[in-house]
């Protein structure tokens, strides 16, 4: 089963695929589809790359915002929609018989939740959860794997501040997480 | 218009080797997987193998693997498919077909070369 | 191995009337399931691609539908010309296979 990332309607996301090059430098062919991966290539592809540069995105809002030149092929799809929710693919076609590296990943888009305006929590997830929220900005250089995530705005109401905070502490403490 | 336009076929004895060509044109061949495909006399069509656009990596069929090779030439829009160690099973009509772009279908089709392999 | 099942064998019908040809998948292959047609002594063309996607050019006659395992090729109302052997081919799993093709034959 897929690895599952959110994201807001309207916000980035960012789903993480990664390789790497043997020796350093030495880039293969990657192609990121709408879709699990097929026996072959990328179903409705998104965007792909040759082995110099990316050479093919089907709309602007598709992005590999990482270290491509070093094997961070994660995907960026900018001002995400409700629509660009589902499957995706990312496959790294390593060369030689039958090599290729196929990673199925799940976006789902939600609606941003009505809250008044409020302090923003800041939390650093270093561990793995099974549901991976995800935004535009991430702030890591090195690879991103499930395991690891990007900075998470939370926003939370006045009025439940204090106890989302306690509880959130709790649940962080329990995950070994930190919070700041 | 796409064109796939097979050749190299004929008559070879069990053992013996065979290369067959694929000329392409109509489209970017150098972005395009091509695949071999055949089909023996009076039956249904068996994958064979496969090669990206770029001819790095390959993909076979287990009933061909250590005993086919497909490569290709983007310079001249050539696809080819080196046969050795062949066995009276390989008798078939052998298409190159060009997939579709997205890796789960094939749109255009060559229209075959025959491959007899008997002593 | 992914087995597609093809039924029926052979169908034996008249010009004009409906054909419902059936693929079934020995486990899920998603969307990713095309069907071909291939007239005696001819290449196959490609008629539904991702299991309900016509091909260019392809009379609107010709309908794909299904998922998972279970396919179907329908032909509204058949044409001379559309007496002949059919495929499915699945790519979703490792390796690629065809059914064993259905007839469609004149009554």
């Known amino acids: 089963s897929e690895v599952e990332y959110i994201a807001e309607v309207g916000q980035n996301a960012y789903l993480p695929c990664s390789y790497t090059p043997a020796p350093p430098g030495n880039l293969v062919p990657v192609c990121w589809g709408k879709g699990a991966c097929p026996v072959f290539d990328c179903s409705n592809v998104v965007l792909r790359t040759d082995n110099r540069d990316v050479n093919d995105r089907t709309s602007g809002r598709y992005w590999l915002k990482g270290d491509f030149h070093k094997g961070d092929v994660s995907l960026t799809i900018e001002n995400v929609t409700l629509a660009d929710s589902g499957v995706y693919c990312c496959r790294i076609q390593i060369p030689g018989i039958m090599n290729d590296e196929k990673h199925n990943v799940k976006l789902v888009v939600i609606k941003p939740a009505k809250v008044t305006p409020a302090p923003t929590l800041q939390r650093d997830l270093t561990s793995a959860f099974p549901r991976m929220l995800t935004t535009g900005e991430h702030g890591p250089a090195e690879t991103q794997t499930p395991g690891s995530l990007p900075d998470v705005n939370l926003t939370v109401s006045n009025f439940f501040c204090e106890l989302q905070i306690f509880t959130l502490t709790n649940e962080l403490r329990d995950s070994g997480a930190t919070i700041r | 218009e796409v064109q796939l336009l097979e050749s190299g076929g004929g008559l070879v004895q069990p053992g013996g080797s065979l290369r067959l060509s694929c000329a392409a044109s109509g489209f970017t061949f150098r972005t395009h997987l091509i695949s071999w495909v055949r089909q023996a006399p009076g039956k249904g069509l068996e994958w064979v193998a496969a090669?990206?656009?770029?001819?790095?990596?390959?993909y076979y069929a287990d009933s061909v693997k250590g005993r086919f090779i497909i490569s290709r030439d983007n310079s001249k829009n050539t696809l080819f498919l080196q046969m050795n160690s062949l066995r009276a099973e390989d008798t078939a009509v052998y298409y190159c077909?060009?997939?579709?772009?997205?890796?789960?279908?094939?749109?255009?089709w060559g229209q075959g070369t025959l491959v007899t392999v008997s002593s | 191995e992914t087995v597609l099942t093809q039924s029926p064998v052979t169908l034996s019908l008249s010009p004009g009337e409906r054909a419902t040809l059936s693929c079934r998948a020995s486990?899920?292959?998603?969307?990713?399931l095309a069907w071909y047609q291939q007239k005696p002594g001819q290449a196959p063309r490609l008629l539904i691609y991702?299991?309900?996607n016509r091909a260019t050019g392809i009379p609107a006659r010709f309908s794909g539908s299904g998922s998972g395992t279970d396919f179907t090729l329908t032909i509204s109302s058949l044409e001379p010309e559309d007496f002949a052997v059919y495929y499915c081919?699945?790519?979703?799993?490792?390796?690629?296979?065809f059914g064993q093709g259905t007839k469609v034959e004149i009554k």
């Open positions: 991702d299991a309900s």
């Open positions: 077909a060009k997939d579709g772009g997205s890796g789960s279908y094939d749109d255009f």
């Open positions: 090669i990206t656009g770029s001819g790095g990596s390959t």
């Open positions: 486990q899920s292959v998603g969307s990713y």
């Open positions: 081919q699945q790519r979703s799993n490792w390796p690629p296979t």
